[in-house]
């Protein structure tokens, strides 16, 4: 069958019909419905929401909607033994205690089951000691402390401000520095934008607000007790001592009112420079310990959270493809929230819900997509991407053979300034073409395309007249699909103006104040940005599932490979003497990139010319496109990170949220001047160049004529 036989309307009209069916008012209604009570992973409330979504997706017209459950390791505070931090005097008396929970937002005073702020998977413990302020607890912050300032964190409790990097990396860095506890806090410099009121009168963080979040270092493993395999009924589970990624020291988050009380007494060294100062009225002294009058006082943590194997539920909906039912385009986003989830995740879940409804409406009118579309409502994303990862582990053989693309659908908004897209280079042209067809929702861009407003507000640093598209990192449910399985992936949301708002994420992220009202009053009263994100995500899924030739352009991969090769070469060339001494050459990598470029160019020419009415040739060409991303997977994975297998991209070893290019080479070069055995270190650089060059060459060959 050709594509047109799969449908009773023309391809162009299909897309228009799908997009026209998406309604802002529905997204608003769905968001309200999803945010009235907490939906914490592993709770009855979240199970009930899973069943509600299953029922509604069936009503919307999907062919089947199933729940997929797993029993995974989760973490909860002890209800009768709360977590808190104290300042204690020399007699051990608690003279100050941090808040046990956040003041409730107006209208939610009587809501039960609001989980108090905690760092998920923190071990239990009651360490006490002197405090050291470690800025953002980044790798470079600890370098500054240990190497330049000669401050030893061993046996100390460190206090770090949230922002810049994933909190799990902060905890890992603190552990490596020998700390015995970590206090995480939100500084107004990062979570309070000037000129904006705090909630409930604006979108800024109040002093009692606290960011929850997991502090794992899973590196893509999924459930800590069943790495590599699904946490099903017959799973073999590791003992807790062998679990993947668990922190070894107690960790707890606080708001800036409480942080003020800890930081105002700090003594010891002054901050090394202004980049270590936040916006509180405190000196930001590094420590260790409190100043003169308070020098006998210590900080004590009281952490009593427990890790528990708990059942979670994904909702998996299927809309069977009419022509290629064995090719899967997946749209997935999580359902579990820390509290109400006004932005994270329900602004995304509401958009997915409306996309499903629109596809269902078309299906009821007799239309089907060319390829199968799978819709997923993932559970336990907040606890380490667990629902998506377990499902992908269970279905890995199907996915690696049939997975065309994965589009992520977490928070639809983190601001209301412009579009933000992170995706594989294969999707650049798809995103460009789609956004040229969509109307911009931005003020001042009436009648203009989304592409135009996006390009104006977020220009590409390399190509004039084009918008910025970023690398995929991690910290969301695309991770297993892209980094482990090599399925082309992308994500889109509306974001803030990064130039004028240099805070990290959005201020109320993972706090109790992430409510429906936050979105409806302050971010998107008309839900026009949500609608635009629905059009982008839905439009991408539509094109990926329905276009006769997959909308992937392999030439864009060639362009970025050259850019990444240049970049990693420049990093290496900071050590010209060592490169000479150890005969380090990038020739093989540049040669492979050149070959890839030439082969991709020839493939693209053939793609224009081949007979699209020949289903065998069409399928062959599409398979070459589908499997190109897969060709960048190294089955052995990256060093010490077996589930990060993509050779071109991986989450940064220093910040899970950020993507790093040629991560194997990058990590081998990182801080190489401090390695005790330079010969071994440079040998590893050479090995990583070899792996990268081989992988790029091998990927290129998958695009060559098959015979």
């Amino acid at each position: 069958k050709s594509s047109n036989e799969a449908t009773n309307i023309t391809p162009k009209h299909n897309m228009k019909a799908f997009l026209d069916e998406l309604k802002a008012e529905n997204i608003k209604k769905f968001l309200y419905n999803f945010t009235q009570i907490p939906h914490l992973a592993g709770t009855e409330q979240n199970f009930q929401l899973a069943k509600q979504i299953q029922s509604q997706w069936k009503e919307f017209g999907l062919d089947s909607v199933e729940l997929a459950h797993y029993d995974v390791l989760l973490s909860y505070p002890n209800k009768t033994h709360p977590n808190y931090i104290s300042i204690i005097n020399e007699d051990g008396n608690e003279i100050f205690n941090t808040s046990l929970f956040e003041p409730p937002p107006p209208g939610y005073e009587n809501v039960s089951d609001i989980v108090p702020p905690f760092s998920a998977f923190s071990p239990q413990g009651m360490p006490e000691g002197d405090l050291v302020y470690v800025n953002y607890a980044r790798t470079e912050d600890f370098f500054k402390l240990e190497r330049d300032m000669k401050i030893n964190c061993s046996g100390k409790i460190v206090i770090a401000r949230y922002g810049k990097v994933f909190r799990g990396n902060k905890v890992k860095n603190a552990q490596l520095a020998g700390a015995k506890g970590v206090i995480l806090y939100s500084d107004p410099a990062d979570y309070f934008a000037p000129g904006v009121k705090s909630y409930p009168d604006g979108w800024n963080l109040p002093g009692g607000g606290v960011q929850r979040g997991n502090i794992l270092n899973l590196n893509g493993a999924g459930d800590p007790l069943t790495p590599g395999y699904p946490a099903n009924e017959y799973a073999y589970r590791r003992g807790i001592a062998e679990a993947v990624g668990l922190p070894s020291i107690p960790v707890h988050p606080i708001g800036y009112y409480d942080a003020q009380k800890l930081l105002e007494k700090m003594g010891g060294s002054a901050p090394p420079d202004s980049s270590w100062r936040g916006s509180l009225k405190v000196p930001y002294n590094v420590g260790p310990g409190f100043t003169g009058n308070f020098s006998t006082q210590k900080v004590k943590m009281h952490i009593h959270s427990t890790n528990e194997v708990t059942r979670i539920y994904n909702v998996i909906g299927t809309l069977r493809g009419a022509v290629e039912p064995d090719r899967y385009v997946i749209l997935g986003g999580h359902r579990d929230s820390w509290v109400f989830g006004g932005i994270d995740p329900q602004s995304g879940a509401a958009v997915v819900h409306e996309i499903v409804r629109s596809f269902g409406t078309l299906k009821k009118e007799g239309w089907r997509p060319r390829r199968t579309i799978l819709f997923a409502s993932w559970d336990a994303e907040e606890f380490g991407l667990l629902g998506s990862t377990e499902w992908a582990e269970e279905n890995s053989r199907l996915l690696q053979e049939r997975g065309v693309a994965y589009i992520n659908a977490d928070s639809s908004i983190e601001g209301n300034y412009t579009l933000r897209v992170d995706c594989t280079p294969l999707m650049y042209s798809l995103v460009h073409n789609l956004t040229k067809e969509l109307k911009s929702p931005d003020e001042g861009f009436e009648g203009k395309s989304l592409y135009e407003s996006w390009t104006k507000k977020s220009p590409s640093p390399e190509f004039s007249g084009m918008p910025r598209i970023s690398k995929l990192g991690s910290g969301n449910d695309f991770e297993v699909f892209f980094q482990r399985l090599g399925i082309a992936s992308g994500r889109a949301r509306y974001t803030k103006n990064w130039e004028t708002n240099k805070f990290s994420g959005y201020p109320l992220y993972h706090s109790v104040y992430e409510t429906y009202e936050l979105v409806e009053k302050f971010y998107d009263p008309m839900f026009k940005y949500h609608l635009t994100v629905a059009q982008v995500r839905g439009g991408m899924v539509f094109e990926l599932a329905n276009s006769i030739v997959l909308p992937f352009d392999c030439r864009d991969y060639a362009v970025v490979l050259r850019k990444y090769a240049d970049k990693i070469y420049s990093i290496s060339m900071k050590h010209p003497q060592e490169m000479k001494t150890y005969s380090v050459s990038f020739d093989s990598l540049f040669s492979a990139v050149k070959n890839f470029t030439e082969i991709a160019s020839k493939f693209s020419e053939r793609l224009q010319d081949f007979d699209k009415s020949n289903p065998i040739v069409l399928r062959m060409m599409n398979d070459q496109l589908m499997f190109l991303e897969r060709a960048f997977i190294d089955p052995l994975g990256l060093p010490d990170r077996p589930f990060y297998r993509h050779v071109i991209y991986a989450p940064s070893s220093h910040n899970k949220y950020a993507g790093e290019s040629f991560p194997g080479i990058y990590d081998a070069l990182f801080d190489i001047e401090s390695k005790v055995d330079p010969s071994k270190a440079w040998g590893e650089v050479k090995r990583q160049i070899y792996v990268a060059a081989f992988t790029v060459q091998a990927a290129a060959e998958t695009l060559s004529e098959v015979a």
């Epitope: 005073e109 705090s198 409930p200 009168d201 109040p206």
Partner: antibody
Framework: EVQLVESGGGLVQPGGSLRLSCAAS????????MAWVRQAPGKGLEWVAS????????YYLDSLKSRFTISRDNAKNSLYLQMNSLRAEDTAVYYC????????????WGQGTLVTVSS | DIQMTQSPSSLSASVGDRVTITCRAS??????LAWYQQKPGKAPQLLVY???TLADGVPSRFSGSGSGTDFTLTISSLQPEDFATYYC?????????FGGGTKVEIK
């Protein structure tokens, strides 16, 4: 000097209406949440209602929500309380008070205006 | 709603005495508590906020302490002008309720 001056109190029959006003001076009115707090004769203090900086959000004691309406006019530095269907138990001195946020104490108080509901 | 219970409801003391008034919240309010002083026929005046911070112009003989559910207002050496009624109030959530008051009278 901060000043809050209430007016509009007086004697009113049960079922009647009254509109209280509070004139503010000596501080930036729009930077403050404003509230009405009442005190029945010989009794303690009872919060009645609050309004946010620009008047877009209002909060009421549940039992009064259907009868009382708080409002403000920042251009006139004025706070109001419209009281309808008044009852004998609404008899009290009504104070206008200012706080610098939703989660904040009442830093400024007016001298109060007496409302007497009686037939 | 969070209820605030003050004790005692009244007390008699002499000038120079140390006076302690307690306030108990029905739920944990951390340090979101204020104390006010009210003299007959006058409006309340803020004494203490955030459980322990003295408001501007308040004499240092006044002090507040406590956290969570139990709070104390202490007058270290009672002065003639301190004879008044004292109220605690939480501002943790809506409605922000007041304690019943403690009347400090001359012995």
């Amino acid at each position: 000097e901060v000043q809050l001056v209430e007016s509009g109190g007086g004697l009113v029959q049960p079922g009647g209406s009254l509109r209280l006003s509070c004139a503010a001076s000596g501080f930036t009115f729009s930077d403050y949440y404003m509230a009405w707090v009442r005190q029945a004769p010989g009794k303690g203090l009872e919060w009645v209602a609050s309004i946010n900086y620009d008047g877009s959000s209002t909060y009421y004691l549940d039992s009064l929500k259907s009868r009382f309406t708080i409002s403000r006019d920042n251009a006139k530095n004025s706070l109001y309380l419209q009281m309808n269907s008044l009852r004998a138990e609404d008899t009290a001195v009504y104070y206008c008070a200012g706080s610098d946020g939703y989660w904040a104490w009442f830093a400024y108080w007016g001298q109060g205006t007496l409302v007497t509901v009686s037939s | 709603d969070i209820q605030m219970t003050q004790s005692p409801s009244s007390l008699s003391a002499s000038v120079g005495d140390r006076v302690t008034i307690t306030c108990r919240a029905s739920g944990n309010i951390h340090n979101y508590l204020a104390w006010y002083q009210q003299k007959p026929g006058k409006a309340p005046q803020l004494l203490v906020y955030n459980a322990e911070t003295l408001a501007d112009g308040v004499p240092s003989r006044f002090s507040g302490s406590g956290s969570g559910t139990d709070f104390t207002l202490t007058i270290s050496s009672l002065q003639p002008e301190d004879f008044a009624t004292y109220y605690c109030q939480h501002f943790w959530s809506t409605p922000p309720t007041f304690g019943g008051g403690t009347k400090v009278e001359i012995k």
